[in-house]
């Protein structure tokens, strides 16, 4: 057991400080301290008495309270009550609160900016490859290939709006039919859900927090995957999305509207454009088989250009190639015609970091990918820390009750639909489902929002992003208006269909159950989260892509047996849990299979072996680094000073009484002090709003 303060020694009356205590509660014996205790047993006592900031922190819960790991944690108030403060304390507390709010908004701002830059980084690293995916001619005939291209491209450019805008431009220029575009849009919907899953990985440090965050993020993934699983075959068979949207587009005489308002971008763009600016047209040009675009850089160099349209004389092989009969002449040898040429004169360079480096896109992308992930991770940790210290006591109670409580009977069922509307509205405001769901993820992690409530918010976010696309479509030029509107509407009705499938009836809310299942697995084997990400967003789509290129026969030949095995396993699993008596004794459980086929334990051993080398060099330098380490190696003895692994391991292994994670403490310093690692300081007093 990690060195925890012995509460028995610390306070004469533990009842006073322990949540729901009725008499003396059992304490967790401090094994590690017992071995190296000096005669002076009072040392830790004085330390704790000096720190009222955490003297009320509950380290031991009643076991019954945490039987269900999905129960929201009690965000315990560890500060002095407002009424008990003197004027100076109240003023100090007020300014602390303001300071926290400013910090929270600041970190939130950089969090959103880092998501934007992460998207740019992905586009620099994989944008051109993504563009080339689109230039594959088989998309037209193979909806499955269209689907995986949608997934891969969106994952590579980290932006569904980029991939859908490429699709729109391809449809407008007749390189793609709406029918062929629909699976790509479905794939883009799946691909966009990777962002918040990556954000969830940043919360790997605390098992229970990670369990909730990862499940909260992957509920989006499962909703999208399940929707596609049902709706893609339905669409291929009936073309209902294509027909409905075509009827809508044809029945209304739309006039070009105004652009969808860029509400969040207005705030973030001034900062992000100082980091990097991209020429997104290059990806579209590659997708449309423009050979010249393949050698162009995505990094924008010139921001102010003067476009001059001039007519130049060009030779043509014959008069038939002339622009028009009247614009055709000869010099006696060659035939000439006049061509309109747009001459672009560069006037002013862009003002961003990479403008004068002339680095290849891959290098810039890699640099930005690393930096944006670090900033994202850092901001997320700080947001979680600040929220953790703000959302305590009455504040937490009020917020949690507001967010997670249903309307009174008989209107309880309406709550979820209101949450869908809120999710849609918020996404419309921030103009990005990735930003909204990524901001939601840490809140799920720290226990402010339940997964049951996050689910409709996420579904609403899916709707919100399509309304943005519809507005953007209405603002597009005449030739692209119809196609972009029809595709935006396909996206909209696909999400509506998905909601109708997986939300109204509580029994059908499979994504929640699946996400919780994955959350439990990932909390136990944290490497599995990365494994899941790679498998679902890269390997499966790439395999399908590869098999599709090999032809229908190969795809069916490999796909049918795989699908058959999956269905067989699912049916067997269902029978095992519902009516095992129907099955022969051997099939009533999975024990007939070798251990590696039915358990992650052997795989865990393999992964641990591979990542053993990381544990040795693992980082005591900073919490961010440690989180990365924990994610890689699921390490029990990794960087104790950052307290992100070891304490939790020991707390969760072989403990009858569940010990709360050190996140209960208000900050790292306090938790370290409590463990006897940092000299105590009486200057720190915690302040909560209520």
């Amino acid at each position: 057991m990690a060195p925890w303060p012995e509460l028995g020694d610390a306070q004469p009356n533990p009842d006073k400080y322990l949540e729901g205590a009725a008499g003396q509660q059992p304490t967790a014996p401090d094994k590690s301290k017992e071995t190296n205790k000096t005669d002076n047993t009072e040392a830790p006592v004085t330390k704790i008495e000096l720190l009222p900031s955490y003297s009320t922190a509950t380290l031991i819960d009643e076991p019954t309270e945490v039987d269900d790991p999905w129960n929201l944690p009690t965000l315990q108030d560890s500060g002095i009550k407002w009424s008990e403060r003197d004027t100076k304390g109240k003023i100090l507390c007020f300014f602390q609160g303001i300071g926290r709010l400013i910090l929270l908004l600041g970190f939130l701002y950089f969090f959103v900016c880092s998501l934007d830059i992460l998207s740019s980084a992905f586009q620099l690293v994989g944008g051109k490859m993504a563009g080339q995916f689109f230039s594959n001619s088989s998309i037209m005939s193979n909806p499955l290939l269209g689907l995986v291209i949608g997934v891969l491209v969106t994952v590579l450019v980290q932006s569904s709006s980029t991939s859908t805008s490429i699709v729109v431009s391809m449809v407008s220029s007749s390189l793609l039919t709406v029918r062929a575009a629909i699976p790509i849009i479905m794939g883009a919907n799946i691909g966009t859900s990777i962002t918040n899953t990556i954000v969830a990985l940043m919360q790997v440090g605390d098992r229970s927090e990670f369990r909730r965050a990862f499940a909260g993020a992957t509920v989006h993934d499962f909703f999208n995957w399940l929707s596609v699983l049902v709706l893609l075959p339905v669409e291929v068979a009936t073309h209902y999305l294509e027909i409905i949207t075509q009827l809508i587009v044809e029945s209304f005489h739309f006039k070009n509207g105004e652009d969808a308002p860029d509400l969040l971008k207005v705030i973030t763009k001034p900062f992000t454009k100082l980091i990097v600016q991209l020429d997104k047209k290059v990806i579209s040009q590659i997708a449309m088989n423009d050979e010249k675009a393949k050698n162009k850089s995505l990094v924008k160099i010139w921001c102010k250009t003067f476009t001059n349209k001039t007519q130049i004389n060009v030779t043509v092989p014959s008069t038939a190639n002339c622009t028009s009969p009247s614009l055709c002449w000869t010099d006696g040898i060659q035939n000439w015609t006049m061509k309109n040429v747009t001459y672009k004169e560069n006037i002013a360079k862009c003002q961003h970091i990479f403008v004068n480096f002339h680095l290849p896109d891959l290098a810039v992308g890699t640099i930005l990918l690393i930096l944006s992930l670090l900033v994202l991770c850092g901001c997320l940790i700080m947001i979680v820390k600040i929220l953790g210290s703000v959302l305590k006591g009455q504040v937490a109670t009020v917020i949690k009750k507001t967010i997670n409580t249903d309307f009174p009977f008989p209107f309880a069922w309406l709550t979820g639909y209101l949450a869908i509307l809120v999710g849609a509205g918020m996404t419309f405001i921030v103009q990005s489902s990735s930003v909204f769901t990524s901001a939601l993820t840490p809140l799920i992690g720290i226990g402010v929002i339940t997964i049951e409530r996050a689910y409709p918010l996420t579904l609403g976010s899916n709707i919100g992003t399509t309304t943005t696309a519809i507005l953007a479509a209405l603002a597009s030029p005449g030739n692209a208006l119809r196609s972009s509107l029809q595709i935006a509407l396909c996206h909209f009705f696909f999400n509506i269909s998905g909601i109708l499938l997986w939300y109204p009836i509580p029994f059908t809310r499979l994504p929640i159950r699946m996400a919780k299942g994955l959350g439990n697995i990932s909390a136990k084997y944290r490497w599995f989260a990365v494994f899941y990400l790679i498998i679902f967003f890269f390997l499966i789509p790439l395999t399908v892509f590869g098999l599709s290129l090999a032809g229908w026969r190969v795809l069916v030949g490999v796909g049918v047996p795989v699908v058959f095995i999956i269905i067989l396993v699912l049916c067997l699993r269902l029978l095992q849990s519902r009516c095992p008596r129907v099955l022969p004794k051997k099939l009533q459980n999975w024990n007939f299979l070798p251990l590696w086929m039915r358990s992650l334990k052997p795989w865990d051993a393999v992964v641990s072996k591979f990542t053993g080398c990381f544990q040795m060099r693992c980082c005591c330098c900073c919490r961010v680094c440690c989180r990365a380490c924990c994610l890689l190696c699921d390490c029990p003895k990794c960087c104790r000073c950052s307290k992100c692994c070891e304490d939790l391991e020991e707390a969760q292994e072989g403990q009858d009484v569940p010990v709360k994670a050190p996140e209960t403490f208000d900050n790292i310093t306090i938790s370290r002090e409590a463990q006897g690692e940092v000299p105590a300081s009486d200057s720190k007093t915690e302040c909560t709003a209520l």
Epitope: N313, C328, T330, D331, I333
Partner: antibody, heavy 120, light 107 residues
């Protein structure tokens, strides 16, 4: 200044060939197309063809195809026009001319002309 | 081949008069038309190209206009030195073709 000096008058029998030369000076020889135009006595102008001395590319009027050959000698900055299987109707003044107005077929410098008489 | 029909074939007028010569192409030639002046015993001389662009050294009393199939050369105020034969030429298609010419004389 630009000068085009043509060879002297020729008298040929029907069926024979004639080779008219045009020596140029005052400009970069390989820059401009050289055109050959003929004018029968008291008649209008008729375009025979053109040559680009830079590459030797030629273009002939379909009417003269198979009978006319244009060549250029860059060492002497001279262009030659040979017309074979002469007939009495080929009697005309043959002009060499260049177009310095790039990309057009409007010719702005002309030689003094070479009279070719075809008679038995 | 594109046929250039020039009219009139000849005209006789007084010094200072306005002279109009027309040229009609058998098909659309855009603006790829040139006008030449040929004095007796001399080589032709370029006056106008691209229908209306005067060649260097050509007096501004010579004006060209038209497009497509109908073209006009106007001598605003005829001078004694303008006595010559005027030819139109199209360079829209190979072979280049000339009009039959208009002989301008002074009464």
């Amino acid at each position: 200044q630009v000068q085009l000096v043509q060879s002297g008058a020729e008298v040929k029998k029907p069926g024979a060939s004639v080779k008219v030369s045009c020596k140029t000076s005052g400009y970069t020889f390989i820059t401009y197309n050289m055109h050959w135009v003929r004018q029968a006595p008291g008649q209008g102008l008729e375009w025979i063809g053109a040559i680009y001395p830079g590459s030797g590319d030629t273009s002939y009027n379909q009417k003269f195809k198979g009978r006319v050959t244009m060549t250029a000698d860059t060492s002497t900055s001279t262009v030659y026009m040979e017309l074979s299987s002469l007939r009495s109707e080929d009697t005309a003044v043959y002009y060499c001319s260049i177009s310095t107005i790039i990309t057009t077929g409007a010719v702005d410098y002309w030689g003094q002309g070479t009279l070719v008489t075809v008679s038995s | 081949d594109i046929v250039m029909t020039q009219s009139p074939s000849s005209l006789s007028t007084s010094v200072g008069d306005r002279v109009t010569i027309t040229c009609k192409a058998s098909q659309d030639v855009g603006t790829a038309v040139a006008w030449y002046q040929q004095k007796p015993g001399q080589s032709p001389k370029l006056l106008i190209y691209w229908t209306s662009t005067r060649h260097t050294g050509v007096p501004d009393r010579f004006t060209g206009s038209g497009s497509g199939t109908d073209f006009t050369l106007i001598i605003r105020s005829l001078q004694p030195e303008d006595v010559a034969t005027y030819f139109c030429q199209q360079y829209s298609r190979i072979p280049l073709t000339f009009g039959s010419g208009t002989k301008v004389e002074i009464k």
